[in-house]
Interface confidence: low
C-alpha cells in the first residue's frame, strides 16, 4: 500500500521575480512514479518550471503572483495511486504603481478633497500621503474639507511593502480654483515608480517645475 504523499517547500512565502521555490513530493518510495498538478491540471510546459530527481522535485525558477497554485503531487506504482493534499504558495509581490482616484486634477474652492490610493500588493502595503513633499498621514484615504487655493500642490501617494522590501509612488498635481467655474485640467500629473521617498520628492520637483513654467 502506497502512503499518501505530501508536499514540502523550501519557501512558502517567496518574493515575486526574485525567489525560486522548490516543491518536493514526499516520501521517497521505490519503484514509484511521481506526478504533479497545478490548478487541478497536469503540469504544462514552461521555461520557468523544472522537474528533477525522477520528477519528485518541482522547481519554480522565478515565481510570479500567478504561481500561487494550488499544487498537488501524486505517486503511483503498478498496484495503486495516491494524491497529496493541495499546497498553496503565498507569493509576496508589489507594491505595483499606485492609482489615485478620483482622477480629477481641478477642484472648486470650498469643495471637499477625498483622494483614495490603491496599489496591488501582497501583503497589503503601508500607505502614506505627502503634500508638497511634506508627510501628512499614513492612511489609504486622504480627506481635506473645504479646500482653498492654499491646498494647491503635488499630492503624492507612497506605498511600501515590508515583505518584499519594495516601495512605489505616484504624484498628482491638484489645482484649486477660487472662481465660480473650475478651470480645465491643465495641471500636469506625473507618476513615478520609485524605490523611496527621494523619488517622490524628485517627481514632486518635476511637477512643480512644469506647473510654474506654464
Amino acid at each position: 500500500e502506497l502512503p499518501k504523499p505530501y508536499i514540502s517547500s523550501n519557501n512558502s512565502n517567496p518574493i515575486e521575480d526574485k525567489d525560486a521555490v522548490t516543491l518536493t513530493c514526499e516520501p521517497v518510495a521505490e519503484n514509484t512514479t511521481y506526478l504533479w498538478w497545478v490548478n487541478n491540471q497536469s503540469l504544462s510546459v514552461s521555461p520557468r518550471l523544472q522537474l528533477s530527481n525522477g520528477n519528485r522535485i518541482l522547481t519554480l525558477l522565478s515565481v510570479t503572483r500567478n504561481d500561487t497554485g494550488p499544487y498537488e503531487c501524486g505517486i503511483q506504482n503498478s498496484e495503486s495511486a495516491k494524491r497529496s493534499d493541495p499546497v498553496t504558495l503565498n507569493v509576496t509581490y508589489g507594491p505595483d504603481t499606485p492609482i489615485i482616484s478620483p482622477p480629477d486634477l481641478s477642484y472648486r474652492s470650498g469643495a471637499n478633497l477625498n483622494l483614495s490610493c490603491h496599489s496591488d500588493s501582497n501583503p497589503s502595503p503601508q500607505y502614506s500621503w505627502l503634500i508638497n513633499g511634506t508627510l501628512r498621514q499614513h492612511t489609504q484615504v486622504l480627506f481635506i474639507s473645504k479646500i482653498t487655493s492654499n491646498n494647491n500642490g503635488a499630492y503624492a501617494c507612497f506605498v511600501s511593502n515590508l515583505a518584499t522590501g519594495r516601495n512605489n509612488s505616484i504624484v498628482k498635481n491638484i489645482s484649486v480654483s477660487s472662481g465660480d467655474s473650475a478651470p480645465g485640467s491643465s495641471g500636469l500629473s506625473a507618476s513615478g515608480s520609485g524605490s523611496g521617498l527621494n523619488d517622490i520628492f524628485e517627481a514632486q520637483k518635476i511637477e512643480w517645475h512644469h506647473h510654474h513654467h506654464h
Partner: antibody, heavy 120, light 107 residues
Framework: ELQLVESGGVLVKPGGSLKLSCAAS????????MSWVRQTPEKRLEWVTY????????YYPDTVKGRFTISRDNARNTLYLQMSSLKSEDTAIYYC?????????????WGQGTLVTVSA | DIQMTQSPASLSASVGETVTITCRAS??????LAWYQQKQGKSPQLLVY???TLTEGVPSRFSGSGSGTQFSLKINSLQPEDFGSYYC?????????FGSGTKLEIK
Amino acid sequence: ELQLVESGGVLVKPGGSLKLSCAASGFAFSSYDMSWVRQTPEKRLEWVTYINSGGGITYYPDTVKGRFTISRDNARNTLYLQMSSLKSEDTAIYYCTAHYFGSSGPFAYWGQGTLVTVSA
Amino acid sequence: DIQMTQSPASLSASVGETVTITCRASENIYSYLAWYQQKQGKSPQLLVYNAKTLTEGVPSRFSGSGSGTQFSLKINSLQPEDFGSYYCQHHYGTPFTFGSGTKLEIK
C-alpha cells in the same frame, strides 16, 4: 472485470448531430478521469475530449472545441459525447477511455469502440 | 501543441528478433510518454507509461526508455503475438497527442 461499452455510432450527414454513450462497469467509475479518443480511417489516433472524475473540468482540442461536449453521470456509470456540426473528418471509430491516474495519466482502459460515419 | 514523430512507419521482422521503435516529442515532455499496442480489429492497449513503466501483465521483453524529447520502445525476442501496430503518446497535459504509428509485420 473492467468494461467500457460504447454505443450510438451511426451514419450521419455533414452538419448533423449525434450522442455517444459509454457504459462503464467493473471499476469505480466515479474515481476515474475519462477521455474519448478516436481512430481515423487512416489509423491515426486522436484525443477528442477529457473530463475529470467529478465532471467539473473538461478539455477539448481546437479541432472539436465548440462542436463536441463531454459529460458524465456518475450515478449511472455512464460517459457521454454530444457531437454537433459534424464534418466528414469526424468519421472515425470513437473509443471511450479511462485514465490510469488523474489528468496526467495515460489511457489505461479502452472500450471496443463505436463507428461514426459522416457522409452525404 | 506538442507534436509526436514516430519512426519507422512500418517494420518487418522475424520471430526471435529484437526491434526498436522511436518517438520524438517537439518539446520537453520529461517522462510523460506512453506506448500502446493495437492488434487488427481490436482496441489499443496500454503497454508502457511514464516512458519506462510496464503496465501489469506486459511481458518483460518489452522495455521503454528515454526522457525529454527522445524515446524508444524495444521488443526483445519477438513473439508471434507481438505483431501489430504501436503508437506513442504524450500524457504531459492536454492536448494529448499520438505518434502516427508503427506497423510491425512478420517477415
